[in-house]
Structure formats: C-alpha cells, structure tokens
C-alpha cells in the first residue's frame, strides 16, 4: 500500500501508474467501492457523483499518455484521510492518504513569558512524530502535542514543524508573534538637574491596553505609583501622575517618559507594567543619579540608584591622576585645589557617567 501525506487546505496527488506507459481505462474509488472518477476509453474524465460532491477531485489529463493516472484531491480536509483504490489493467492499487495540520494554541500572538503549545491534527491510525524548530534554532520534538514554556522575544517569527510518518515528511510553517518590550531592562545614568528620558519600544503596535509605572526610590522601602496611562489606537493618554515630578509622557508610541529634572531623591528602580487583553508585560527601569557638590572645604561626589558592586566612583582634577577612587557610592576630597574637577562612575574600563564641577576657591559652598 502506498502512503501519501497531505496538508489540510492544500492539494495531494495520489499515484497510479500503468505498466504499459500509455493511456488506458482506470477508475479511482473509495474503499467502500463508491466511484470517484475515471477514464473509460474515450479520453474523457468521468466523475462518479454530482459536481458539488466531487469538485475537489481531479486527475492530470496530461499525464495519461505517459501511463500515469493520478488522483488529485484539492482543499484537503481531515476526513479525506482514508484508503483510495485505483483500478486499472485488472489490478487494484491501494493508496493511503493521511492529512495533517499543525495548529498553535488559541492564538499565534503571545506575550513574553507565556507558553506556546503546538498541536498536530492527525487522523486515526497515524502514528506521527513532530519536530519543530524555533526562529532562533531551538528544536523541540514530541508526539501530537508540543509545548514551549517561557517564550522570549527571539521566539517571534516562523516556526517550522516537520511531521514524520513512515519515513515520509510533511512540513508546516507557523508564524508566531511574541509580544514584548524590545529590551528587558533600561538604566539611565544622569547628573542631578539633567532631564532623563526613558523609551519603551514594543515589538508590536496594534494592541490596546493600560499601564503604570511603580517606583521605589533607593531611600524608600516601598513602591509607589508614579504614572498611569492608557493606550488606544496607538495614542497614549495619562490617567494619573505624581504632581511633584512633573513627568511627561509622549502622546504617541513608542512609550516615552521624561523626567524634566532628576535629583538624588528620585534615584531608584521601577517596574513598568503594560496590561493587554492577553496578559501583562513587565519592564524594569533604573535611574542612577550623580551629584557633585562643594561644601565648606570638602568636594563630595555621590551616586544613588541601582549600581553594581563592581562600579567605581573616581574624583579627579581634569587631566590629572585620580585623587580618590573607591567601589562605593560616596567619595570625598578635602581641601580640593581650584580648577575643574571630574567625578566618574565606571565599571571596568567603561565610563557610565561623569559630572564636572568648577572648584573656585577653598571654603566656597557650591552644588
């Protein structure tokens, strides 16, 4: 028995070959002997039933002269999975057709962190195995159901699933969109008094939802709401905002939040949540603020906010050797020389931020 694999909605060609390699009488039947179509000697294709019933069935007239009498089944359905019989030259050839389909659970648009389930639709009697390859090259293998947990942004794209049955293969392509922020965390390094702008680009634009930014300043022990907003038809509207911060939210996507003037008291970290119909996305936001000030006879450089333990603060006069360099959040120089001083926040050989101050004369207070 010949096996043919097909994909739902597409076409399948069931072979039937004559040993004579010339046109001959043939008939295609279902296994219950109902006639589908055939050619009875005049080179005319005769259908076995009403046109509406058999309009998906056809043959290749151009192949008849070569002794090939295939049965073409268009717009395949799962229930087409059965045995078909080709009768020619006093013999019967059986062809088994199995129609498959791969579907994604509920939706092909999923949120980052959610699970994707790929289901193989297969007819009774088939014993397939499935291997699916993600856009980032990860392979998963299994029976009729495959699951991938904790989807990431890189899982967006075309998944290729290969169904294997009796050493034959049929390939399916499924487009999956993982809805996510384009980066997992954002950190801004700013000097006191500067403005800070956070942009939260999404890899999609067609969703409506609402969101809020909860913030925990380093000096605080709790999160508090900074701003809440809604997104409708790609337009962003502020619902509620903390007054003293004078936060500005851009009215169009991508989501862009601006703090006109940062200060040490704002330094800390926040969690931006965006709630869509499908669930909630999270984005971590960090703000590191540096302040350099001269008070009495002491020059102080201080940073607040989430810095790594490997970060180093350096105070030095411009074009001079470092006067003080510590893996801590505050450094001081007593009785600094007049001139331009620089405070650097660095990690390894990478400078994250620097701030400058002109020391006028000893004992003058300035910030």
């Amino acid at each position: 028995k010949t096996l043919v694999l097909g994909k739902e909605g597409e076409s399948a060609e069931l072979p039937c070959e004559s040993s004579q390699k010339k046109i001959t009488v043939f008939t295609w039947k279902f296994s219950d002997q109902r006639k589908i179509l055939g050619q009875h000697g005049k080179g005319v294709l005769i259908r076995g039933g009403s046109p509406s019933q058999f309009d998906r069935f056809d043959s290749k007239k151009g192949a008849w002269e070569k002794g090939s009498f295939p049965l073409i089944i268009n717009k395949l359905k799962m229930e087409d999975s059965q045995t078909y019989i080709c009768e020619l030259e006093n013999r019967k050839e059986e062809v088994e057709l199995w129609v498959f389909k791969v579907t994604a659970n509920s939706d092909t648009h999923l949120l980052q962190g959610q699970s994707l389930t790929l289901t193989l639709e297969s007819p009774p009697g088939s014993s397939p195995s499935v291997q699916c390859r993600s856009p980032r090259g990860k392979n998963i293998q299994g029976g009729k159901t495959l699951s991938v947990s904790q989807l990431e942004l890189q899982d967006s794209g075309t998944w290729t699933c290969t169904v294997l049955q009796n050493q034959k293969k049929v390939e399916f392509k499924i487009d999956i969109v993982v809805l996510a922020f384009q980066s997992t965390a954002i950190t801004a390094y700013k000097s006191e008094g500067e403005s800070a702008e956070f942009s939260f680009p999404l890899n999609f634009a067609e969703e409506n939802g609402w969101g809020e930014l909860m913030w925990k300043a380093e000096k605080d022990s709790f999160f508090q709401p900074w701003i809440s907003f809604s997104i409708k038809n790609k337009e962003v509207s502020v619902q509620k905002s903390t007054k003293d911060l004078k936060l500005q939210l851009k009215e169009t996507l991508p989501l862009t939040l601006k703090i006109p003037q940062v200060s040490l008291q704002f330094a800390g970290s926040g969690n931006l949540t965006l709630t869509l119909d499908k669930g909630t996305l999270h984005q971590e936001v960090n703000l590191v603020v540096m302040k350099v000030a001269q008070l009495n006879n002491t020059l102080t450089c201080e940073v607040m906010g989430p810095t790594s333990p490997k970060m180093r603060l350096t105070l030095k006069q411009e074009n001079q050797e470092a006067r003080v360099s510590e893996e801590q959040k505050v450094v001081q120089v007593v009785a600094p020389e007049t001139g331009l001083w620089q405070c650097l926040l660095s990690e390894g050989d990478k400078v994250k931020m620097d701030s400058r101050i002109q020391v006028l004369s000893r004992g003058v207070n300035q910030t």
């Epitope: 028995k1 799962m78 999975s81 059965q82 045995t83 088994e96 389909k101 579907t103 659970n105 389930t117 289901t119 639709e121 297969s122 007819p123 009774p124 009697g125 014993s127 397939p128 195995s129 293998q141 299994g142 029976g143 009729k144 159901t145 699951s147």
Partner: antibody
C-alpha cells in the same frame, strides 16, 4: 492519579437526546486526543468517535454520523458526546478513553491506555 | 472497514496452563494492534499495544505476537484473575474495530 469519570447516561425514548460528559483529572487534558467507545449489553465493543487535543479533528463511526457530536472543553477538563435522534441500537455502556503514546528510538506508538468506568444509556419506549 | 475475527469464541483452560488466543484482520493492519481484557461490570483494560508491547503494569505472563493480519495473545501460566473476556482491536485506520471477543473460562 489519572482518572476519567463518565456521567449523563440514563433512560431515554427513541428519537430523544442525551448529553454524556467525561471529567478528566490527574493529567494535562489539553495534551491528549480522546475517544468515545460503546458496548451494547452482552455484546462486543464499538468505537464511536475520536477527537484531537484541540478539538479540530473529529471522526465518527458511520452508524452515528449526523446524530452524535463529540466536543471538548479543555478549560474544564471535560469531554462530551451529544447524542440526538437516539435509536434502540444505541443502547450501550459508553466509555470515554484517552489516547496515549510511547516513544522508542524517535518512533511514536499510539494506543488507548486509560478508560473510564462507563455510563449506561438505555433507549427504550 | 477492517473486520477482526477472534478464535476461538470460548476457551476452557486449567489454572497454571498456557492459553493461546488468535485474531485475524480482514486486511493488513501492520502492527497497529492491541489486546484488551474485560471482566464483568468493568471497563476493558489494555494488555498489549503495538502488537507485542506490554502495557504498564501488565504481568510478563502476557505476551503478544504477529503482524499484518495474524495475531496471537499468549498467557503462559494462567492465574485465577486471568479468566475474563479478551478483545483484539486494530488502530490502523478509521474506523477502529474490535474482534467479537474470546471468553476464557476455568476448566
């Protein structure tokens, strides 16, 4: 543990309707193909219907086509069989059963491993 | 549809003896074939699938063989709990069909 419990059986007149339910527990229902199988009193077993894990692919035996409808609700871990235009010959114990598989050297073998205890349907005037 | 024919319809065997049950398919079902055991008032219990693979927790005294159209279930040394009705079934294509059953009785 893995369990399938059928309900909804009873006495019904010819031409009447019944809806059978099968409640699944102890496994991820949405991952499995399911089946209804019946057994007439003192007789052998007959496969009635087959449904894929998503509920998209459905097959019926010829004697029930157009009268019976198989469906599932994966959120409720439930399988159903809506039986309309019932006939005396539909009298039977109806079992729900799970299609299992084993994997050996990347070959997948499917079989019906887990059965419920059954629910009795009697069609009589 | 594929017709499954079991033989014999009934079989009387003494405990401790070997029992051999046969099943023939009207056309080849490859190895997509199973054996079930059913006791009165209970659901069928899967014994063998894939023609020869024992299902989970089935004792080693049960063994299946065959391929294509001829299949055999052998119970090497009958225990009292083995007396029941045995059904064969193919799952090669739709519709899946069962044999009419073999009743294994105590001699």
């Amino acid at each position: 543990q893995v369990q399938l419990v059928e309900s909804g059986g009873g006495l019904v007149k010819p031409g009447g309707s019944l809806r059978l339910s099968c409640s699944a527990s102890g496994f991820t229902f949405s991952d499995y193909y399911m089946n209804w199988i019946r057994q007439a009193p003192g007789k052998g077993l007959e496969w009635v219907s087959y449904i894929s894990s998503s509920g998209i692919t459905i097959f019926y035996t010829d004697s029930v086509k157009g009268r019976f409808t198989i469906s599932r609700d994966n959120a409720k871990n439930s399988l159903y069989l809506q039986m309309n235009s019932l006939r005396a010959e539909d009298t039977a114990v109806y079992y729900c059963a799970r299609e299992d598989y084993s994997n050996y050297e990347d070959h997948y073998y499917y079989y019906t491993g887990v059965w419920g205890k059954g629910t009795t349907v009697t069609v009589s005037s | 549809e594929i017709v499954m024919t079991q033989s014999p319809a009934a079989l009387s065997v003494s405990p401790g003896e070997r029992a051999t049950l046969s099943c023939r398919a009207s056309q080849s079902v490859s190895n997509k074939f199973a054996w079930y055991q059913q006791k009165p008032g209970q659901a069928p219990r899967l014994l063998i699938y894939n023609a020869s693979t024992r299902a989970t927790s089935i004792p080693a005294r049960f063994s299946g063989s065959g391929s294509g159209t001829e299949f055999t279930l052998t119970i090497s040394s009958l225990q009292s709990e083995d007396f029941a009705v045995y059904y064969c079934q193919h799952y090669n294509n739709w519709p899946y069909t069962f044999g009419q059953g073999t009743k294994l009785e105590i001699k």
